[in-house]
C-alpha cells in the first residue's frame, strides 16, 4: 500500500498554489523512494466457457522500470497451493509459456491477459496471480487476492465420430430397406400384369390415415 496512486487512502495535499514548485519537488524526490509496494489486481470471479476456457486480466502496479517480469498462476484449493503455469517475459515482448502449458497469455504494459484451457469441473478453485519483477534490482513480489474460477462440465455427449457411424448405419439400412421394398413391389406388380394388356393409372383415395397425405398409384387392368 505504499505506492501513491495505488493505496486506498491517498495523501491529501492541501498546498497553496504558490507552493507548486515544492509540490513538484516532493513528487520528483519522494515518489521514486516511496512508490514501491507492488499491488496486484485481478477479478474476483470468472466463469469458464463450456469448452473449459477461462480468461482474466492480472494487473500490477510496477514500482519501477522493470525489464524482466515473471508471471506465475497458482491454484489454491483446500489450503494447498500448486503452480499451474509460469512465464518470464521481457517488457514489450510476448508472453511465452512452455509448449505443454495449459496457459497462454499476452502482455500490455503492466497488464497480463491470461487464458487457462482444458479446465474441468474438478479444476474449480482460486487462481492466484503472482508477479515478480526480476530485473533490474531490487526484486519485488506481488501476489493477487485470487480469481475464483468456476468450471461447469457440459452435459455428456457421445463422441462425434460415433454419432457419424450411427447415422451412416441407419441411413444405409433405410436405403437398403426401401430398395428391397421397391424391388419386391415391382416384382409383384409385374407378375400380376398380362404382357398384352394395356392399362391406365388412376388415383385412388388413401388407404392410410389422413395424416399421411400420400396417394399411391394402383394398376388396374382394362379388359
Amino acid at each position: 500500500m505504499a505506492c501513491l496512486g495505488f493505496q486506498r487512502h491517498k495523501a491529501q495535499l492541501n498546498l497553496a498554489t504558490r507552493t507548486w514548485p515544492c509540490t513538484l519537488l516532493f513528487f520528483l524526490l519522494f515518489i521514486p523512494v516511496f512508490c514501491k509496494a507492488m499491488h496486484v489486481a485481478q477479478p474476483a470471479v470468472v466463469l469458464a466457457s463450456s469448452r473449459g476456457i477461462a480468461s482474466f486480466v492480472c494487473e500490477y502496479a510496477s514500482p519501477g522500470k522493470a525489464t524482466e517480469v515473471r508471471v506465475t498462476v497458482l491454484r489454491q484449493a483446500d489450503s494447498q497451493v500448486t503452480e499451474v503455469c509460469a512465464a518470464t517475459y521481457m517488457m514489450g515482448n510476448e508472453l511465452t509459456f512452455l509448449d505443454d502449458s495449459i496457459c497462454t497469455g499476452t502482455s500490455s504494459g503492466n497488464q497480463v491477459n491470461l487464458t487457462i484451457q482444458g479446465l474441468r469441473a474438478m479444476d474449480t478453485g482460486l487462481y492466484i496471480c503472482k508477479v515478480e519483477l526480476m530485473y533490474p534490482p531490487p526484486y519485488y513480489l506481488g501476489i493477487g487476492n485470487g480469481t475464483q474460477i468456476y468450471v461447469i462440465d457440459p452435459e455428456p455427449c457421445p463422441d462425434s465420430d460415433f454419432l457419424l457411424w450411427i447415422l451412416a448405419a441407419v441411413s444405409s439400412g433405410l436405403f437398403f430397406y426401401s430398395f428391397l421394398l421397391t424391388a419386391v413391389s415391382l416384382s409383384k406388380m409385374l407378375k400380376k400384369r398380362s404382357p398384352l394388356t394395356t392399362g391406365v393409372y388412376v388415383k385412388m383415395p388413401p388407404t392410410e390415415p389422413e395424416c399421411e397425405k400420400q396417394f399411391q398409384p394402383y394398376f388396374i387392368p382394362i379388359n
Epitope: 500500500m1 505504499a2 497458482l74 497451493v81 526484486y139 506481488g142
Partner: antibody, heavy 123, light 111 residues
Framework: EVKLVESGGGSVKPGGSLKLSCAAS????????MSWIRQTPEKRLEWVSS???????YFPDSVKGRFTISRDNARNILYLQMNSVRSEDTAMYFC?????????????????WGAGTTVTVSS | NIVLTQSPASLAVSLGQRATMSCRAS??????????IYWYQQKSGQPPNLLIY???HLKPGVPARFTGSGSRTDFTLTIDPVEADDAATYYC?????????FGAGTKLELK
C-alpha cells in the same frame, strides 16, 4: 528524510495504562502499514500490533483486548494505547513501517524503525 | 505459532573470514512458491535494520557481502568477508503465518 520518533514511555504499575506515540516525517503515515514491535530486556523481539491503510488493526493473542492501535492522519502520528499492563509488557517499544518489496496476503516486515521508547511495568 | 530457532547464539569470527548463522523454523515458512524469511542487523543501542527480504534479496544499500539462502524450514545468513562494522546481533523473522515471529538472535563478535 524518512523518520519515526517514539515517545510516551515511562514507568507504570501493573494494571495501569500508558499511551505511546510515534511521529512520522518524510512520508504520509496513512499510506503505509504501520506496526509496533517491542524488545524485551532479554533482547527478544516481539510483534505487538499493526495498522493497515484501510483501517484494519491486528494484534497477537498476548495483547489482544488490552492494547489498541490508532492513527491521527492530520498530525501524521501513530498511537499505541496500553491498558491493564503486566510485568511481561516491560520492553523497549519500536514503531516500524512495513517494507515495500512485497505485497500480498502475508504479514509484515519492516524497513524503517524508530529509535524506541522504554516502558517499565513495576509495582 | 511458528518458532524460529537461531544458532549459534554467539559467534566469534576474524576480520576477513566468513560468518555463517542459521535460522530454523518449527514448520515451513514457504507459501506461493516463496519463503517468507527476513534478516535484520541490530547494533548496540540502535533499532534493528533490515538486510535481506524474502530469503535472499538484499535491501538496496546493503553490501553484497551479505547473502541469504534456504527454503521451507532451514535458512542461512552468510557474511563474507566479515568487516569490523558487522559486529552486531542478527535476527531472522517470518511472516508466512500469523503472528509474525522473530528468532532469538545470533551475536556476531570479532576475534
Amino acid at each position: 528524510e524518512v523518520k519515526l520518533v517514539e515517545s510516551g514511555g515511562g514507568s507504570v504499575k501493573p494494571g495501569g495504562s500508558l499511551k505511546l506515540s510515534c511521529a512520522a516525517s518524510g512520508f504520509t503515515l496513512s499510506n503505509f502499514d504501520m506496526s509496533w514491535i517491542r524488545q524485551t530486556p532479554e533482547k527478544r523481539l516481539e510483534w505487538v500490533s499493526s495498522f493497515t491503510p484501510d483501517g484494519n488493526t491486528y494484534f497477537p493473542d498476548s495483547v489482544k483486548g488490552r492494547f489498541t492501535i490508532s492513527r491521527d492522519n492530520a498530525r501524521n502520528i501513530l498511537y499505541l494505547q496500553m491498558n491493564s499492563v503486566r510485568s511481561e509488557d516491560t520492553a523497549m517499544y519500536f514503531c516500524a513501517r512495513k517494507g515495500p518489496y512485497y505485497y500480498g496476503p502475508r504479514g509484515w516486515f519492516f524497513d524503517v524503525w524508530g529509535a524506541g521508547t522504554t516502558v517499565t511495568v513495576s509495582s | 505459532n511458528i518458532v524460529l530457532t537461531q544458532s549459534p547464539a554467539s559467534l566469534a569470527v576474524s576480520l576477513g573470514q566468513r560468518a555463517t548463522m542459521s535460522c530454523r523454523a518449527s514448520e515451513s515458512v514457504e507459501g506461493y512458491g516463496t519463503s517468507f524469511i527476513y534478516w535484520y542487523q541490530q547494533k548496540s543501542g540502535q533499532p534493528p535494520n533490515l538486510l535481506i527480504y524474502l530469503t535472499s534479496h538484499l535491501k538496496p544499500g546493503v553490501p553484497a557481502r551479505f547473502t541469504g539462502s534456504g527454503s521451507r524450514t532451514d535458512f542461512t545468513l552468510t557474511i563474507d568477508p566479515v568487516e569490523a562494522d558487522d559486529a552486531a546481533t542478527y535476527y531472522c523473522q517470518q511472516n508466512n503465518e500469523d503472528p509474525l515471529t522473530f528468532g532469538a538472535g545470533t551475536k556476531l563478535e570479532l576475534k
